[in-house]
């Protein structure tokens, strides 16, 4: 209708990076920019994704290098993390959130794809990492190895081999395991501290240089107490599980101190593994009963999990696997290991800014049934799995509903702000829920809408529209872009209107009648008034139309509702040659060229397109006759 198709600004970017997957208009003290997501962008050798800032009138885009942002204290994997897959602007302070839903970190032998987002302030500076699903690894452990180095240990090389082999089993790195070694005999010394080395390679190298210090006495109690009071302090981390491994070949010369030492270790929650090396006893034919009892006393209960004995130093190699496995069985002590909570949550798959924080869709949470998490300045709210049971029953728990595929919110005059989330795979047909979140990790689900057709992906895109700008939502639009009709993936957008606290179905938006795939409803944007009639409008993307070139449809708002017939259909081919997937993302909240009219930003594969609004001239015709 009044969007200019003759002189668009087509901003080029990398197709392989999928520059244009997301677009947002951005205002910094009057300077207008486009923020463009490129979730497959490369940074160095890694395909991290990234975000670009693009000047609106002329000039080149600049990469923000958010892909280089690193989280300390985790062993992160940023390759394929899809930074820029979702963008959310905060109009209050012009900051925005760029999410990497496939950001993952190493935990033991697993990679947990918790997702993370970067908050960027209004002048494009990174300000904060938002990662509400990130939990400490179960391998967040400080392990201190307490080695008996007294004269009776022989040959020392076997102890060294054992040490090296057990260290190779440890997941050493930021956010995971730290290892320190103390050696004792008559005295105790730090061989190295917990925070001296950050990789298996470095720790193994250091361990290979530990020499036997000797000593005629075996002060095991002192060794344990030294480890507890000093080794765990120097480089120890708050909240890390404390594990001690004691390796000795004889009764201690300070066993009367063991009671107090062990009590203090218990108080400090130190889990103790104890290894009795019987070489000295066996070589001399001595009964080891008293020694074994002492080592069992040192080991945490139950003994069968924490106590080991070997015939001699050479046999230490035989317990490496068992010891390693027992330590790592600490990981999921009370956990059903086949079930995932937030470990694979992919938080940030969708994002939406609300007054007190940000909502993040986490499609992979709770075994891919999905969840919505909220991060606020006061902390995070992570609803429990059980909170969703009313609308996501236990019997469908293995279906992978993908709740959080999209998130938004509505405002009703009675309930205030209510959150909305889509679960496009729920029971194969899709579902949308409207809910409020509580600080006790529960939800109140007010309403649910269900899709009609299997595989239609109902709820993969949701937009709330305040048509008249009074602060109360009038219309909720739900996309089902895979809706199959007349032999093609045509797509459908469902219209729900707010009537006394409930959204009531009121038909669908009309698309064009082409006979190709379209995926109408892949993106739906509530945009500010385009046609200057004081009603806000809606733009719907159909990125597969015209043989994957793409198209957008503009629907006008009118008196608290939306007109279901498009006022303008803009195809990619009208604008420029070679555009593909035009309409995969849409944003229209700002006047970008200072003409007083709201302009549109539309994403495509490798391009961002700005469409300028033209003024609407209203001609009121009146006839009067003279003489009357």
């Amino acid at each position: 209708f009044n969007m200019d198709t003759r002189k668009p600004r087509v901003i080029p970017g990398s197709r392989t990076a999928f520059f244009g997957y997301t677009v947002q208009q951005h205002d910094i003290s009057g300077n207008k920019w486009l923020v463009v997501g490129a979730p497959l962008e490369t940074n160095g050798y890694q395909k991290t994704g990234d975000v670009y800032k693009c000047p609106v009138i002329h000039g080149n885009c600049t990469k923000l290098n958010l892909g280089r942002v690193t989280l300390s204290n985790v062993s992160e994997r940023k390759d394929n993390m899809r930074l820029g897959l979702s963008l959310a602007t905060n109009p209050k302070d012009n900051s925005f959130l760029a999410c990497s839903p496939l950001w993952s970190h190493e935990c033991g032998s697993s990679y947990y794809t918790t997702g993370m987002c970067s908050r960027v302030n209004s002048n494009f500076r990174f300000s904060k990492t938002v990662a509400p699903a990130l939990q400490r690894c179960q391998t967040y452990m400080d392990i201190v190895i307490v080695l008996d180095g007294s004269n009776s240990i022989y040959p020392w090389v076997e102890v060294q081999h054992f040490l090296i082999n057990i260290l190779k089993k440890f997941y050493i790195g930021p956010g995971q395991i730290q290892v320190g070694v103390v050696q004792y005999g008559e005295d105790v010394v730090h061989e190295f501290h917990l925070n001296d080395y950050r990789s298996v390679k470095d720790v193994v190298e250091a361990a290979s240089h530990i020499e036997q210090r000797g000593g005629t006495e075996t002060r095991t109690a002192f060794g344990i107490e030294f480890a507890r009071s000093e080794a765990f302090q120097k480089g120890g981390r708050k909240g890390a599980k404390k594990v001690m491994i004691v390796i000795t070949d004889g009764e201690s010369h300070d066993s009367p101190d063991l009671e107090k030492v062990i009590q203090q270790s218990e108080r400090d929650n130190v889990t103790r593994y104890a290894v009795a090396v019987l070489g000295y006893y066996n070589r001399r034919g001595i009964n080891p009963e008293t020694f074994l009892n002492e080592i069992k006393y040192i080991a945490s209960d139950p003994d069968d999990k924490h106590f080991f004995n070997v015939t001699d130093e050479a046999a230490l190699k035989d317990i490496v696997d068992a010891l390693g496995d027992r330590i790592f069985s600490l990981e999921g002590t009370n956990k059903n290991e086949t079930s995932f909570g937030l470990e694979m949550s992919q938080t940030g798959f969708s994002s939406h800014v609300v007054e007190d924080g940000v909502l993040l869709g986490a499609v992979g949470a709770y075994d891919w049934n999905g969840a919505v998490l909220k991060e606020t300045s006061a902390g995070k709210v992570i609803p429990l799995r059980e909170s969703y049971l009313k609308e996501f029953p236990e019997e469908l728990k293995n279906h992978g509903a993908y709740l959080g595929y999209t998130v938004t919110s509505v405002v009703s005059s009675r309930q205030g702000r209510v959150y909305v989330a889509g679960a496009p795979r729920f029971n194969h047909t899709g579902k949308v829920i409207l809910f409020t979140m509580h600080n006790n990790r529960s939800l109140t689900i007010h309403q649910a809408m269900r899709g009609q057709q299997i595989g239609s992906y109902f709820g993969s895109e949701i937009t709330s529209v305040d048509i008249d700008g009074d602060g109360v939502t009038d219309v909720l639009l739900v996309g089902a872009p895979m809706y199959f009709n007349e032999g093609r993936e045509r797509g459908k957008v469902y219209v729900y209107e707010l009537r006394q606290n409930l959204f009531v179905y009121n038909g669908t938006l009309k698309d064009s009648h082409s006979y190709q795939n379209a995926r109408f409803g892949s993106s739906i944007a509530s945009v500010r008034d385009l046609n200057q009639d004081s009603y806000n409008d809606v733009v719907v993307g159909a990125p597969l139309e015209d043989n994957h070139a793409g198209a957008i449809y503009i629907f006008h708002g009118f008196r608290g509702s939306i007109l279901k017939t498009p006022k303008q259909r803009i195809t990619a081919s009208e604008l420029a040659t070679g555009l593909q997937y035009f309409g995969c993302s849409i944003h229209g909240q700002l006047d970008l060229n200072e003409d007083g009219l709201i302009d549109l930003a539309v994403g495509a594969l490798g391009n961002a397109v700005i469409l300028w609004s033209r003024p609407v001239v209203q001609i009121n015709a009146s006839l009067h006759f003279e003489p009357s």
């Epitope: 008559e186 006495e217 002060r219 109690a221 002192f222 107490e225 009764e251 201690s252 010369h253 300070d254 066993s255 009367p256 101190d257 063991l258 009671e259 107090k260 062990i262 008293t290 009892n293 002492e294 006393y297």
Partner: antibody, heavy 120, light 109 residues
């Protein structure tokens, strides 16, 4: 030759204090434990307190807890028993004895004893 | 706390007699039980450690044994210098808390 010599005993009024010393020679206090054991006139042996000179861990009999303090000065190779708030029932001969690994945690050497009399 | 109950509290015997003194622990204990001999006006002397090991310099007529929670000191052939008071002593495992028995006075018959 291993030797333990107690000193510091004497007559003291109820509520008073006394400090007993146990000077060790012929071995290093650092690698052993010292126990104080007492024997009231005509009675059996009663364990009083112990200290690990190395770790400074201490143990006390319930009857003296809070009143007696055991300590050691490894540089002087001497152990001490500080006795406060003394009562008539604390009257006894006080022995110090060595306790260590090599005698399988038995008291292998004893001092000659020092008499403490608590009386008004 | 572990109690050591020593019996008898006294006994009369003649030179050459076999004498047996018993200590019963109130609960299961380690073998860290020792026996001491004390003569009037003198400090106690160690005879037996670890329930059955003879301390150096102690005559072989002294022996110790264990049966469950019962510990026994045996003098195979009583000698004139053996008339004294005998004490058992138990060490609490992994602490330096110790307990003595009440003592057994061996007198000349």
């Amino acid at each position: 030759e291993v030797q333990l010599v107690e000193s510091g005993g004497g007559l003291v009024q109820p509520g008073g204090s006394l400090r007993l010393s146990c000077a060790a020679s012929g071995f290093n206090l650092y690698s052993s434990y010292i126990h104080w054991v007492r024997q009231a006139p005509g009675k059996g042996l009663e364990w009083v307190a112990s200290i690990s000179s190395y770790s400074s861990y201490t143990y006390y009999a319930d009857s003296v807890k809070g009143r007696f303090t055991i300590s050691a000065d490894t540089s002087k190779n001497t152990a001490y028993l500080q006795m406060n708030s003394l009562r008539a029932e604390d009257t006894a001969v006080y022995y110090c004895a060595r306790y260590w690994y090599h005698s399988a945690w038995a008291l292998d050497y004893w001092g000659q004893g020092t008499l403490v009399t608590v009386s008004s | 706390d572990i109690q050591m109950t020593q019996s008898p509290s006294s006994l009369s015997a003649s030179v050459g007699d076999r004498v047996t003194i018993t200590c019963r622990a109130s609960q299961s204990v380690s073998s860290a039980v020792a026996w001491y001999q004390q003569k009037p006006g003198k400090a106690p002397k160690l005879l037996i450690y670890s329930a059955s090991s003879l301390y150096s310099g102690v005559p072989s007529r002294f022996s110790g044994s264990r049966s469950g929670t019962d510990f026994t000191l045996t003098i195979s052939s009583l000698q004139p210098e053996d008339f004294a008071t005998y004490y058992c002593q138990q060490s609490a495992p992994y602490s330096s808390l110790i307990t003595f028995g009440q003592g057994t006075k061996v007198e000349i018959k």
